[in-house]
């Protein structure tokens, strides 16, 4: 599919940075989400995992942004091979891991 543009990925990274920096209380009340395989289909995988968190305004913009990088519709309760369904981590840790990976992609130029 189309390659996510440089500036759009930068916006997504900035939003994740914003979340990690502004975090005071436990992010999303400490909600847990499935880990994802960062090596393939990271955008859809991240959306599939985060879409199951509801009522957390802090990550709503991230969820929306991720949908712009994923070609198919993602719904809550939807599971694919992109999710590592034997490990759950806190949303805060998930966001940090995703941020680290996207920064790596950004600097490598492999958007």
């Amino acid at each position: 599919g189309p390659v996510p543009p440089y500036t759009a990925l930068k916006e997504l990274i900035e939003e994740l940075v914003n979340i990690t920096q502004n975090q005071k209380a436990p992010l999303c009340n400490g909600s847990m989400v499935w880990s994802i395989n960062m090596t393939a289909g990271v955008y859809c995988a991240a959306l599939e995992s985060l879409i199951n968190v509801s009522g957390c305004s802090a990550i709503e913009k991230t969820q929306r942004m991720l949908s712009g990088f994923c070609p198919h519709k993602v719904s809550a309760g939807q599971f694919s091979s992109l999710l590592v369904r034997d490990t759950k981590i806190e949303v805060a840790q998930f966001v940090k891991d995703l941020l680290r990976h996207l920064r790596k992609l950004f600097h490598q130029g492999t958007f």
Epitope: P5, T7, A8, K10, E11, Q63, R64, G68, F69, C70
Partner: antibody, heavy 123, light 107 residues
Amino acid sequence: EVQLLESGGGLVQPGGSLRLSCAASGFTFSSYAMSWVRQAPGKGLEWVSAFSGSGGSTYYADSVKGRFTISRDNSKNTLYLQMNSLRAEDTAVYYCVQDGLGPYFYNYGMDVWGQGTTVTVSS
Amino acid sequence: SYELTQPPSVSVSPGQTASITCSGDKLGDKYACWFQQKPGQSPVLVIYHDSKRPSGIPERFSGSNSGDTATLTISGTQAMDEADYYCQAWDSSTYVFGTGTKVTVLG
């Protein structure tokens, strides 16, 4: 605060041309897709055209294909709609709309709308 | 071309529930959005991703989407909810808006 300000509307004769502009502020313009949506008097909403973010793809409704051209100048934070061969049925309020991010921007939801500019095609 | 069909009008008493449907072929496979438009004003996004509310939109607005039908529900409808409502989806490289529904709050 995200703001969109349309201009360029007016009265034009059938077969004539008009160029609409939309000045954007309050967000990283180049990252976001942008659309034009119109509304004829007393009628519903009709999408006209979209321009993706830095990906550069353009999309058009069948009703305007070949007559209208969407473009953008990221250095000026401005979206344009060049309208040629105008017809009476093109009479409408034209809204500039902020779309989403990424190649599948249409998944995002049209968040921010301008106030609109009125185009009247009449002899 | 893809079409989204809505009832032309829906009437509701204050405090009651209004439901607006939007029908289109396999609409449940796509993300549906809903817009509210009051006379003389620009449209406002009230639901995206089938059921998500943008910040600032009251909780009384909710949405669902499955099969061929998306539904916008306004619970505890207030006089200020009187407006035109449009559904929207993306199909084959074009946005499609529904035909629009005028919601009238009685009394």
